[in-house]
Interface confidence: medium
């Protein structure tokens, strides 16, 4: 059966300064390959974090990846800014071997909207 | 049993101002995001605005951005939107949709209100 | 923004008929898709949510299929009840949520 990528949440408020955590889970690890988390959709998508050991500023996966099947990739947003706001996805890739990682299922996205403190 | 009741339309001229309301029952209103969807005649369906179950999230269409505003009453189970400088693209039958709790679509809708904007 | 368009406009077929209706998005929505029922004089109602899923009370000669930007609502076998407007919506790119133009179901 096809993985299945799901962000509980439709919207978080945090206020500017304190941290969120955005919710993913999967329903498979298989195919092989990475989770990343964007901000927006389209040309104008930002890649916000990478469960590929990267290190990514003020962002940082909340449960341990490295242990055997585990299935949440959510992540938490230190100091939030008001720059944070936006529509935040989590995507699953499947890894090719020569060619790119191929994108094959999305959450339905998380709107972040950050409120003045 | 989910029931949204539309009220509030009528003729007016273009320009003028009109508030539509939503009484909402059989359901925690404050716990759903709430819409106005918009149907001119003949037409089809066009979403106008979507308020979060807080009220604090708010967004509109870019045709109505300006002139409308959406609100919403917990304490009365109620949705508004109050449509100023109205114009004769506005005429539609509006519609008051409850957003599923999980997703952006739409599980219940009210049976709509006409606003005719004509001089 | 994300467009959908419906095809065909118009659907001219008989009762017991098969009606097999498309929508396309100009970009991938993944399985982030709904189709509406709507008669003459009444609201939209939720036939389909998840490009697949039945909503509550819908009858199994409903189903939705298509994953990305290419997606089907068929229904197997039209009854008189079935001839209506129906429309698909996304709800991955939001705001703002956007619908096809419909596709109108006739009595041939």
């Known amino acids: 059966t096809e993985v299945k990528v799901t962000q509980p949440e439709k919207s978080v408020s945090v206020a500017a300064g304190d941290s969120t955590i955005l919710n993913c889970t999967v329903t498979s690890l298989l195919p092989v390959g990475p989770i990343r988390w964007y901000r927006g959709v389209g040309q104008s998508r930002l890649l916000i974090y990478s469960f590929t050991g990267e290190h990514f500023p003020r962002i940082r996966n909340v449960s341990d990846t490295t242990k055997r099947n585990n299935m949440d990739f959510s992540i938490r947003i230190s100091n939030v800014t008001p720059e944070d706001a936006g529509t935040y996805y989590c995507v699953k890739f499947q890894r090719g071997s020569s060619e790119p990682d191929t994108e094959i299922q999305s959450g339905g996205g998380t709107e972040v909207y950050v409120l003045a403190k | 049993d989910v029931q949204l009741v539309e009220s509030g339309g009528g003729v007016v001229r273009p320009g003028e101002s009109l508030r539509l309301s939503c009484a909402a029952s059989?359901?925690?209103?404050?716990?759903?995001?709430m819409n106005w969807v918009r149907q001119a005649p003949g037409e089809g369906l066009e979403w106008v605005s979507l308020?979060?179950?807080?009220?604090?999230?708010?967004y509109y269409a870019d045709s109505v951005k300006g002139r409308f505003t959406i609100s919403r009453d917990n304490s009365k189970n109620t949705l508004y939107l109050q449509m100023n400088s109205l114009r004769a693209e506005d005429t539609a039958v509006y519609y008051c949709a409850k957003e599923n709790n999980r997703y952006r679509f739409f599980d219940d809708w009210g049976l709509g209100t006409l606003v005719t904007v004509s001089s | 923004e994300i467009v959908l368009t419906q095809s065909p406009g118009t659907l001219s077929l008989s009762p017991g008929e098969r009606a097999t209706l498309s929508c396309r998005a100009s970009?991938?929505?993944?399985?982030?898709l709904a189709w509406y029922q709507q008669k003459p004089g009444q609201a939209p109602r939720l036939l389909i949510y998840g490009a697949s899923s039945r909503a509550t009370g819908i009858p199994d000669r409903f189903s939705g299929s298509g994953s990305g930007t290419e997606f089907t609502l068929t229904i197997s076998s039209l009854q008189s009840e079935d001839f209506a407007v129906y429309y698909c919506q996304q709800y991955y790119d939001r705001p703002p949520l956007t619908f096809g133009g419909g596709t109108k179901v006739e009595i041939k």
């Open positions: 059989g359901f925690t209103f404050s716990s759903y995001d």
């Open positions: 970009q991938s929505v993944y399985t982030y």
């Open positions: 308020i979060s179950g807080s009220g604090e999230i708010i």
